[in-house]
Each structure stands twice: as C-alpha cells, then as structure tokens.
C-alpha cells in the first residue's frame, strides 16, 4: 500500500537508511512530501515485523518500489493510496 | 535466451545525428528498466541514460541530458538512444543493457556494442 | 555525483592465487554495488550485485564484500580465464558511476 500524507508536523525522520528492503517485508510505505515545517520529502516505510524505517528517497531502490506499486494499485480497488490534507 | 542486438553505428560527422536501436528478445521487456552505456576506445565504462518500464521515467547522464534522448517502444521489444550535435567525444562503442527491476540490480546482459565514431 | 575509485589499474597474479580488487566510493551508497568483468574484445558481464550477491552462473571463486564507502571484490583461485578488466559500479542513485577499471594480469 502507498500513502501520501499531508501533515502539519514537522520532519518526521531523525535518521535515514538505505538498505534495500525486500518487497515481501513491507506493509506499507508512507510518503510525506517537502513542505509544512519539514523542507525534505520523507518515506517511512512500515515493515511487517511492526517495525518502521525511513528510506532516503535518493535511492534508487525505494524509487522502483513504489513505482511498482503505483502501478498495482493503480489496477486494483479501491486504490489504496491516501491523501490526507492539513485540517 | 535473453538477446540484446544494438543497430549498426557508423561514422557521422561533427553536429549532426544519429539514432541507435536496440531490439530484445528472450524476456518480457516490459518488465525491466534498460540502460544505455558507452566505453571510449581503451578507456572505461561511462553510463549514458536509463529507462523504466513504460519509458514515464528517463535518467541520464548531466552532460548529455541536452543531447540525446532515451526511448523504448515495448510493442516491438525496441530500446533506442537519439544523439543530435554530435561531438568528437562521444566517439565511442554504445552498449545497451538490461538494466534490473525493483528487486534486482545491476546489468545482467548486454548487446555485443555498437561502434559510433564522430569525425569530419 | 557518487566517485567511484578503484586505486589499481593494473593487478599481476598468478594462476591459483587469491586476488584482492578494491572500490572506494565517495559517499556511502549503501552495499548499492555491482561489479563486472570485461575480457578482451567482449562486452561486460555481470558478477555480482548488491555488493555480495552472485549473479546467476558466475563462479563461487568470485566473491564481492564490503558496506560504507569501501567494497572488494575477490577471487579465491584466479583461472586463466579470468584474465580481464573488472569494473565497480554503484546502484544507489542515477546517475550509475562506475569505477575507473582494474586490469588483472596473469604473470
């Protein structure tokens, strides 16, 4: 599942990683665009073991993840991706 | 088997230009981003560009951004590099390579190279 | 731009040795490496990604370690057959970079 959310926090990511992370290992990935207190674009990815990882979004590999999918979602209902505006 | 067959290059002249094709066969090509990658004459590997999937996604090398442009026709299994203004320095053989998917890295096969020498 | 710099342009060895091929980056990319061979005459060939991972068929003579900015690439008993320029490249992040090349020599 991908997600876009809207926040009014501020960066949600103290430290990122890099390391690849198996598609079979991942629930959902939550994107949180530049803007609203925060001046970077954050993935977080959330595991299947519960556990949550920020991705820098410079790598290649996340980049192909969620293109992917994109891609599935966009062929399945409901789409699973949200947008959440700032209240 | 997987098979990558670049066009044939060629000579061209300085400032003009030149399309290569690359046709594939032996894989479903639409599930793979593919890459062009040229190598001067006793001298290393430099990327060119790559493409995704559908070719809505395009990366190239800075120097180059200008000038040429990737492309893909995943009807007829094609991967093409267009290179206008043409110069000395892109003398050089062009490979085109498969380049991995979203969990799978690296170019594991490659055309046999293509030679474009750029000269008047 | 990530730098990749394999500091040997040139290896000698000897059949059966163990061989050592360094690539230092100029960040950290993250174990994001692939390394390829190129005999002479032929296009480059695939041996491992992911720093570590082997690639279909290749021989488990061939062995890719490393993480941060430094990896290496070894083979355990060079054959004749390895005679070749084996290349670093990094898969972090467009645009791909590869190292300068290093030339492995049989004496």
């Known amino acids: 599942v991908l997600e876009v959310y809207y926040t009014s926090l501020r960066c949600r990511c103290v430290q990122e990683s890099s390391v690849f992370i198996p598609r079979r290992f991942i629930d959902r990935i939550q994107i949180l665009p530049r803007g609203n207190g925060c001046p970077r674009k954050e993935i977080i990815v959330w595991k299947k073991n519960k556990s949550i990882v920020c991705v820098d979004p410079q790598a290649e590999w996340i980049q192909r993840m969620m293109e992917v999918l994109r891609k599935r979602s966009s062929s399945t209902l409901p789409v699973p991706v949200f947008k959440r505006k700032i209240p | 088997e997987v098979k990558l067959v670049e066009s044939e290059g060629g000579l061209v002249q300085p400032g003009s230009s030149m399309k290569l094709s690359c046709t594939a066969s032996?894989?479903?090509?639409?599930?793979?981003?593919m890459t062009w990658v040229r190598q001067v004459p006793e001298k290393g590997l430099e990327w060119v560009a790559n493409?995704?999937?559908?070719?809505?996604?395009?990366n190239y090398l800075d120097s180059l951004k200008s000038r040429f442009i990737i492309s893909r026709d995943n009807a007829k299994n094609i991967l093409y590099l267009q290179m206008s203004s043409l110069k000395s320095e892109d003398t050089a053989t062009y490979y085109c390579?498969?380049?991995?998917?979203?969990?799978?890295?690296?170019?594991?096969?490659w055309g046999q190279g293509t030679s474009v020498t750029v000269s008047s | 731009d990530f730098v990749l710099t394999q500091s040997h342009k040139f290896m000698s060895t000897s059949v059966g040795d163990r061989v050592s091929i360094t690539c230092k980056a100029s960040?950290?990319?993250?174990?994001?490496v692939a390394w390829y061979q190129q005999k002479p005459g032929q296009s480059p060939q695939l041996l491992i990604y992911?720093?570590?991972t082997r690639h279909t068929g290749v021989p488990d003579r061939f062995t890719g370690s490393g993480s941060g900015t430094d990896y290496t690439l070894t083979i355990s008993s060079v054959q004749a057959e390895d005679l070749a320029l084996y290349y670093c490249?990094?898969?972090?992040?467009?645009?791909?970079?590869f190292g300068g090349g290093t030339k492995l020599e049989i004496k």
């Open positions: 390579a498969r380049d991995g998917n979203y969990h799978f890295y690296g170019m594991d096969y």
């Open positions: 032996g894989f479903t090509f639409t599930d793979y981003y």
């Open positions: 493409i995704n999937y559908d070719g809505s996604r395009t």
């Open positions: 960040q950290d990319v993250s174990t994001a």
């Open positions: 992911w720093a570590s």
């Open positions: 490249q990094q898969h972090y992040s467009t645009p791909w970079t």
